[in-house]
């Protein structure tokens, strides 16, 4: 058993069919010695008396908010949560496996630049009685500070018969140098509590590997005289690290017809302009990627040919 | 530590071109190592990230873009910097800074070159003949060093008398390639920045 936060305790249950469970001794936080009684959750039924209460925790019904009282007055609370291990594996029932980039990916994180700021998100089908808390650090043995905000519900989607909820959190490394070469990964730890179930999820990454620039901005077309060609120009996104001559991007320019089946013409360039042939009803899209370290491409920025 | 005597190449274009070739070569070599050594811990997640130049060179600090010298986190790095005099940064004596930066890059390349050559000699003794260093990568390191045009004592290749542990050597190769790729990215950024300046 360990303390998650004040008056909230996590009982680790290594479960197998004939598992004996965990013996837990709760102590009432009071100088009083006599006349102490214990209750569970909202029930007024007395579970036991005395300064300590011993319980055998074997299933979720044994967890909950234990309260000690004296003469109708509440003395202290202890909320017991269960963290379940089955076949040597901690449960992952609360969050959905996003399966990208690989199986057992529960947390996904992205950074728009090298400033040390990043966003992580996760999915669940649970809508109520759910709380998250996020901690992060650079490295684990001699951790350096990363500050994370509160996790918030960022999107709701309908997937077949189920509703899916997306939560996200923003974190910022306390002293980040954009030019630094990372040797220790960022660690992100999410504590998830659903009713009386506790689970924790972790992700470890280098900022350089989760970079995904914003799409190029100010995408414009300039028709070339007496030609079907156009000059496409764009700018670096505002959120990208500066100076741009040091943090350079490379770009992919695509001409796409109305039909998805039509052949796509693609041009790759390090410049912020390109000359392409604009077909009728086609659209021109540009996306960006770090020029020197191949992490993710940005989303497309698009303009119609007409 | 004595710095090599700096006679940097007046045109940055050759260095930019060579640094791009270097990044391409090391990235290809790393990809090849990951595929060939698929049953070894060779991915970024599996290896320990070691920097053989740590405490010996300070490329990141010495080559910091002017715009980032205002960022305290970039200056309060835990690595020792060539630039101990803060006012030097403020006044930005460009040619002096550039010399420090390029000599630091040169030193990096020299250290990696020695390590890779020593490692290749061991890998050539492996009866499995599983993986060798790409000669193109070694050549590109050499070309960039020549383009940087520094006069520096040659470092003798490390020789070892004991029987090589090929498993350890291959893991060390992965560690080295990952670190060198990261440094090659920094070098490419620096060359691009200097070229634009």
């Amino acid at each position: 058993i360990w303390e998650l936060k004040k008056d909230v305790y996590v009982v680790e249950l290594d479960w197998y069919p004939d598992a004996p469970g965990e013996m837990v001794v709760l102590t009432c936080d009071t100088p009083e010695e006599d006349g102490i009684t214990w209750t569970l959750d909202q029930s007024s039924e007395v579970l036991g008396s005395g300064k300590t209460l011993t319980i055998q925790v074997k299933e979720f019904g044994d967890a909950g908010q234990y309260t000690c009282h004296k003469g109708g007055e509440v003395l202290s609370h202890s909320l017991l949560l269960l963290h379940k291990k089955e076949d040597g594996i901690w449960s992952t029932d609360i969050l959905k496996d996003q399966k990208e980039p690989k199986n057992k990916t529960f947390l996904r994180c992205e950074a728009k630049n090298y400033s040390g700021r990043f966003t992580c998100w996760w999915l669940t089908t649970i809508s109520t009685d759910l709380t998250f808390s996020v901690k992060s650090s650079r490295g684990s043995s001699d951790p350096q500070g990363v500050t994370c905000g509160a996790a918030t519900l960022s999107a709701e989607r309908v997937r077949g018969d189920n509703k899916e909820y997306e939560y996200s959190v923003e974190c910022q490394e306390d002293s980040a140098c954009p030019a630094a070469e990372e040797s220790l990964p960022i660690e992100v730890m999410v504590d998830a509590v659903h009713k009386l179930k506790y689970e924790n999820y972790t992700s470890s990454f280098f900022i350089r590997d989760i970079i995904k620039p914003d799409p190029p901005k100010n995408l414009q077309l300039k028709p070339l005289k007496n030609s079907r060609q156009v000059e496409v120009s764009w700018e670096y996104p505002d959120t990208w690290s500066t100076p741009h001559s040091y943090f350079s991007l490379t770009f992919c320019v695509q001409v796409q017809g109305k039909s998805k089946r039509e052949k796509k013409d693609r041009v790759f360039t390090d410049k912020t302009s390109a000359t392409v042939i604009c077909r009728k009803n086609a659209s021109i899209s540009v996306r960006a990627q770090d020029r020197y370290y191949s992490s993710s491409w940005s989303e497309w920025a698009s303009v119609p040919c007409s | 530590r004595n710095l090599p005597v700096a006679t940097p190449d007046p045109g940055m274009f050759p260095c930019l071109h060579h640094s791009q070739n270097l990044l391409r070569a090391v990235s290809n070599m790393l990809q090849k190592a990951r595929q060939t050594l698929e049953f070894y811990p060779c991915t970024s997640e599996e290896i320990d990230h070691e920097d053989i130049t740590k405490d010996k060179t300070s490329t990141v600090e010495a080559c910091l873009p002017l715009e980032l010298t205002k960022n305290e986190s970039c200056l309060n790095s835990r690595e020792t910097s060539f630039i101990t005099n803060g006012s030097c940064l403020a006044s930005r004596k460009t040619s002096f800074m550039m010399a420090l930066c390029l000599s630091s890059i040169y030193e990096d390349l020299k250290m990696y070159q020695v390590e890779f050559k020593t490692m290749n000699a061991k890998l050539l003794m492996d009866p499995k003949r599983q993986i060798f260093l790409d000669q193109n990568m070694l050549a590109v390191i050499d070309e960039l060093m020549q383009a940087l045009n520094f006069n520096s004592e040659t470092v003798p290749q490390k020789s070892s008398l004991e029987e090589p542990d090929f498993y350890k050597t291959k893991i060390k190769l992965c560690i080295l390639l990952h670190a060198f790729r990261i440094r090659a990215v920094t070098i490419d950024r620096v060359m691009s920045y200097l070229n634009a300046s």
Epitope: L40, Q42, S43, I55, E59, F60, G61, D62, K84 | -
Partner: nanobody, 126 residues
Framework: EVQLVESGGGLVQAGGSLRLSCASS????????RGWFRQAPGKEREFVAA??????TYSDSVKGRFTISRDIAKNTVFLQMNSLKSEDTAVYYC?????????????????????WGQGTQVTVSS
């Protein structure tokens, strides 16, 4: 999944006693509460007793006569029935709830339960 198997039913004289057992297997860690319900011919299934950790609750009709208890080690719940009456004649069902209610009295509702046993017949002759 949770499996429940009842035993201990039978024919008994009015005023007599019986002890019903309900053994649970499968993913029993997910259980929040266990309960006993009964169904007499032509009647609705009604709540008898429930247990969660050390908490117990009873229907008014059996209070003082029946006792629900739990053997943690054996994953078994018992219903000790004393002073049996002819109106206690019914099929007795064991149930397990895997939903959490902070208000324990919610476990006296039939729809709070997710898993049910096959039932065991109790006949009280007068």
């Amino acid at each position: 999944e949770v499996q429940l198997v009842e035993s201990g039913g039978g024919l008994v004289q009015a005023g007599g006693s019986l002890r019903l057992s309900c053994a649970s297997s499968g993913r029993t860690f997910s259980i929040y509460a266990r309960g006993w319900f009964r169904q007499a011919p032509g009647k609705e299934r009604e709540f008898v007793a429930a247990i969660r950790s050390g908490l117990t609750t009873y229907s008014d009709s059996v209070k003082g006569r029946f006792t629900i208890s739990r053997d943690i080690a054996k994953n078994t719940v018992f219903l000790q029935m004393n002073s049996l009456k002819s109106e206690d004649t019914a099929v007795y069902y064991c149930a397990a709830a895997v939903n959490y209610f902070t208000d324990f009295t919610d476990y006296s509702k039939r729809d709070s339960y997710d898993y049910w046993g096959q039932g065991t017949q109790v006949t009280v002759s007068s």
